[in-house]
């Protein structure tokens, strides 16, 4: 503890200028004071001034008023500092002395004489209020006041509590009268070292190093750090915990960037055609009559079906067509003839037969010719008879289909299986694909044809989720997850509403 006992001398009266021994001072009593402060004693005794002692210079002669003085010699109030816990009780001895010697340091002069002394014993609490008193004896009167206050940075009823205001990272506070800490605005905690974060800042996901701040922990964002950060690259997905990518409806894949509902999101099919989803980013347009193209964007010519007969020429109109008939024919499609067999209307050796009592005719055409007048040479390839991309070739009276690799038959309708020759070694499963066969290898083998024996089984760690089957040998990473219906992803970890078109390669 640490404090100061302060004694304010106010007035001393010694009208007759007498000493304690009854003698008078010549020419007057040049008065100074000795003060002794010690622990409480029921009966004041001589001995050390345990709480401190102090002397004044000469303050006046006989009777005088003592003025307050804050510095230098003759300071008033007198200060008796102590470095212990104030006990609340004390004994005080104030002696008035006459000196014939030095005004400033009378204590050292020989021949000093006692004028009077007073003794005060009692209790005194720490506080700023002065206790005023007056003591008389037969010859003198002393008016004075006193108090005990704590030294700077000491607080409490016994000045025992040290508190220094501070504003650094070990505390942001001022000191209360009792020495307890009073946190500066924006700070809290036992030592006022904890900043009060921005109001609403998430307790777990945010923190602050100074008041009204909200710093987000990894994986969180937003003013209050209450929004999770989705997986980097997550396109059409959200998160409920950091680094998640839960796909929005109609999206799939690790980054929710695979469109499982391309039809709805992009409406690629034109002219009233029907769109059908077929896996990630896949769709098919089914065209209404009169339209063609991948997106049914191309309108078919109204003349495409060759509606004009008997050599009539067809002309497209806005919503229909018009047939220009050759001489001797009439009707919407030039289907009516004004000719008879007498006009020899049949070409290329066709034979004419009269009909309707000779008012019309019909031509019977020789092989390789057709048309109502046998005017057209038969093109056996017009009906696109070759399947699977086969090329049609006219060969005199017949035609042949030249098939693409992997197909055979008159119309290339038969698929030659690449798997027929069993290209997969070590019991691998063969898949016929457009670009050739693919082998799915059993555990322990890899390579295009399962010909490589691997010492490390990539499937051994069980990398596939949701009941997917693990295969090795299909990829550089040596394993493939074949997902069950309803799951996608390199490890079949993401649920979707559609089956994968082919195993995801990990």
């Amino acid at each position: 503890g640490s404090g100061i006992f302060q004694l304010r001398l106010q007035e001393f009266v010694n009208q007759r200028g007498m000493l304690a021994n009854g003698q008078s001072c010549e020419p007057g009593c040049r008065t100074f004071f000795r003060i002794c402060l010690k622990h409480f004693q029921a009966t004041f005794s001589e001995g050390p001034c345990t709480f401190g002692n102090v002397s004044t210079p000469v303050l006046g002669t006989n009777s005088f008023v003592v003025r307050d003085k804050n510095s230098g010699s003759g300071r008033n109030p007198l200060q008796l500092p102590f470095n212990f816990t104030w006990p609340g009780t004390f004994s005080l001895n104030i002696q008035a002395w006459h000196t014939p010697g030095d005004d400033l340091r009378p204590e050292t002069s020989p021949g000093n004489s006692l004028i009077s002394q007073i003794i005060i014993q009692g209790s005194l609490a720490v506080g700023k209020i002065w206790r005023t008193d007056e003591q008389n004896d037969t010859l003198t009167r002393l008016s004075y006041s006193y108090r005990v206050i704590c030294s700077d940075n000491y607080y409490g009823e016994s000045c025992s509590r040290l508190c220094k205001k501070r504003d650094d990272h070990f505390g942001h506070y001022e000191c209360q009268p009792d020495g307890s800490l009073s946190c500066l605005p924006g700070w809290t905690g036992k030592y006022c070292d904890q900043p009060i974060c921005l109001s609403g800042c998430h307790e777990q996901n945010g923190y602050c190093s100074k008041p009204d701040e909200c710093i987000c922990r990894p994986g969180w964002q937003g003013r209050l750090c209450n929004e999770c950060i989705p997986h980097n690259g997550c396109r059409h997905g959200t998160c409920s915990i950091p680094w998640q990518c839960a796909c929005d409806e109609g999206w799939g894949g690790l980054f929710c960037d695979q469109d499982l509902n391309y039809c709805t999101h992009h409406s690629p099919c034109k002219n009233g055609s029907t769109c059908s989803n077929s896996g990630p980013k896949g769709y098919t347009c089914t065209c209404l009559p009169g339209y063609t193209g991948e997106h049914c964007e191309l309108g078919l010519s109204k003349c495409a079906s060759n509606p004009c007969r008997n050599g009539g020429s067809c002309k497209d109109q806005e919503n229909s067509y018009h047939c220009l008939c050759p001489p001797g024919y009439y009707g919407q499609h030039c289907e009516h003839s004004t000719l008879t067999c007498a006009d020899s209307p049949c070409f290329n050796g066709g034979s004419c037969r009269e009909r309707n009592q000779g008012s019309s005719y019909a031509c019977e055409c020789p092989p390789n010719f057709t048309g109502s007048n046998c005017e057209k040479k038969v093109d056996r390839c017009t009906s696109n008879p070759c399947a699977n991309g086969g090329q049609c070739q006219n060969r005199g009276p017949s035609r042949t289909c030249r098939c693409r690799p992997g197909f055979t038959g008159t119309h290339c309708e038969l698929h030659i299986s690449d798997c027929a020759r069993s290209p997969c070694a070590h019991g691998g499963t063969c898949h016929d694909l457009e670009n050739g066969p693919v082998c799915t290898c059993p555990a322990g083998f890899s390579g295009r044809r399962c010909e490589v024996r691997i010492t490390h089984d990539a499937c051994a760690s069980g990398p596939c989720f949701n009941g997917a089957t693990c295969y090795t040998g299909l990829s550089p990473n040596n394993f493939v997850c074949n997902c069950p219906y309803g799951f996608v992803g390199s490890r079949c970890e993401f649920p979707v509403g559609l089956p994968p078109s082919f195993p995801w390669v990990a």
């Epitope: 220094k164 070990f170 036992k190 070292d193």
Partner: antibody
Framework: EVQLQESGPGLVKPSETLSLTCTVS??????????WGWIRQPPGKGLEWIGD???????YYNPSLKSRVTISVDTSKNQFSLKLSSVTAADTAVYYC?????????????WGQGTLVTVSS | SYELTQPPSVSVSPGQTASITCSGQ??????ASWYQQKPGQSPVLVIY???KRPSGIPERFSGSNSGDTATLTISGTQPMDEADYYC?????????FGGGTKLTVLG
């Protein structure tokens, strides 16, 4: 009982970066009651405070070194680290890590045994 | 920048009282700590918050701080107290050490 142990290279070339790690054992670095500091002492000279860090990552640096110092904390490993860039011979010193207690007004009640770092080519 | 000044050396006879001072502008308004460092060893905290002793520090170590000066007092000094002593205070968010005082126990 809490113990602190410095580790890192004892020799660093001029202009390079000095890197040291302090491992705390016997207590958690995530305690809200302490800051974790670095202090150095050149041979035959006095102590110089470098900087300190709280478990949340808040850092405080000596203004005279601030442009070159980075202190970081890894609560999962119970470690904190010091990086001092562009070192010169004047950075040769024994480097101490220490625990600074809030309850002691910032006094350092636990110290590592110190590690001598020499800056020389 | 804030500075703390200590005398480079202080000598004392065994059993006598040694006083080591540390001065800095308005140091009495800050908390002072004192560290003892023996050759080849790490510093040890002997006084914190001006006058408080950590557990395990002998009662002969005491401290005070007012005005511009903090004082470490070792009463009944023993030969084992011979060491370097450093004062330390915080100036805002920066730790500041004094230059250190070598205490020599004579005899």
């Amino acid at each position: 009982e809490v113990q602190l142990q410095e580790s890192g290279p004892g020799l660093v070339k001029p202009s390079e970066t000095l890197s040291l790690t302090c491992t705390v054992s016997g207590g958690s670095i995530s305690s809200s009651s302490y800051y974790w500091g670095w202090i150095r002492q050149p041979p035959g000279k006095g102590l110089e405070w470098i900087g300190d860090i709280y478990y949340t990552g808040s850092t405080y640096y000596n203004p005279s070194l601030k442009s070159r110092v980075t202190i970081s904390v890894d609560t999962s490993k119970n470690q904190f680290s010091l990086k001092l860039s562009s070192v010169t011979a004047a950075d040769t010193a024994v480097y101490y890590c220490a625990r600074q207690a809030l309850a002691l007004g910032g006094g350092s009640d636990k110290w590592g045994q110190g590690t001598l770092v020499t800056v020389s080519s | 920048s804030y500075e703390l000044t200590q005398p480079p050396s202080v000598s004392v006879s065994p059993g006598q009282t040694a006083s080591i001072t540390c001065s800095g502008q308005r140091l009495g308004d800050k908390y002072a700590s004192w560290y003892q460092q023996k050759p080849g060893q790490s510093p040890v905290l002997v006084i914190y918050e001006d006058s408080k002793r950590p557990s395990g520090i002998p009662e002969r170590f005491s401290g005070s701080n007012s005005g511009d000066t903090a004082t470490l007092t070792i009463s009944g000094t023993q030969p084992m107290d011979e060491a370097d002593y450093y004062c330390q205070a915080w100036d805002r968010d920066t730790g500041v050490f004094g230059g250190g005082t070598k205490l020599t126990v004579l005899g």
